[in-house]
């Protein structure tokens, strides 16, 4: 039986990003997102 293993050869870094809601609308508070490989995904 063969074992398949994916190895991309590089590590994808992620970073928490925080924005103020008032910068993108009229609400108060902070919005937390996640940047993975240079793209904000959440």
């Amino acid at each position: 039986d063969a074992e398949f293993r994916h190895d991309s050869g590089y590590e994808v870094h992620h970073q928490k990003l925080v924005f103020f809601a008032e910068d993108v609308g009229s609400n108060k508070g902070a919005i937390i997102g996640l940047m993975v490989g240079g793209v904000v995904i959440a």
């Epitope: 990003l17 924005f19 008032e22 910068d23 993108v24 108060k28 902070a30």
Partner: nanobody, 124 residues
Framework: EVKLEESGGGLVQAGGSLRLSCAVS????????MGWFRQAPGKEREFVGA????????YYADSVKGRFTISRDGAKNTVYLQMNSLKDEDTAVYYC?????????????????WGQGTQVTVSS
């Protein structure tokens, strides 16, 4: 050109308090998002906290949450960092920084205006 100037640093005993000020000149204060960073000897500059342009919202690093408070005074074009219950590990050079609206508040590269820094030393 926007200029930021910090003041209020100094030597304080552990458990004590200190208030840093950051005077902003040369720009429209209400359009600049303000933050505080710090850099301890031999370490990278780290995010401390930030305040929104209106002053209605603040956000803090976990390491200072509940002890530090950021406020801003639009009449004086000044941002404040009130530091209470100071610990040895709070010893660092503290920098105030300004960023354009819409940028992430917790990362260094969002900020394009920086003060010269003020030293805070906490002794036990």
């Amino acid at each position: 050109e926007v200029k930021l100037e910090e003041s209020g640093g100094g030597l304080v005993q552990a458990g004590g308090s200190l208030r840093l000020s950051c005077a902003v000149s040369g720009g429209t204060f209400s359009s600049i998002g303000m933050g505080w960073f710090r850099q301890a000897p031999g370490k990278e500059r780290e995010f401390v906290g930030a305040i929104s342009r209106s002053g209605d919202s603040t956000y803090y690093a976990d390491s200072v949450k509940g002890r530090f408070t950021i406020s801003r005074d639009g009449a004086k074009n000044t941002v404040y960092l009130q530091m209470n219950s100071l610990k040895d590990e709070d010893t660092a050079v503290y920098y105030c920084a300004g960023r354009p609206a819409g940028t992430a508040i917790n990362i260094r590269r969002s900020y394009n205006y920086w003060g010269q820094g003020t030293q805070v030393t906490v002794s036990s």
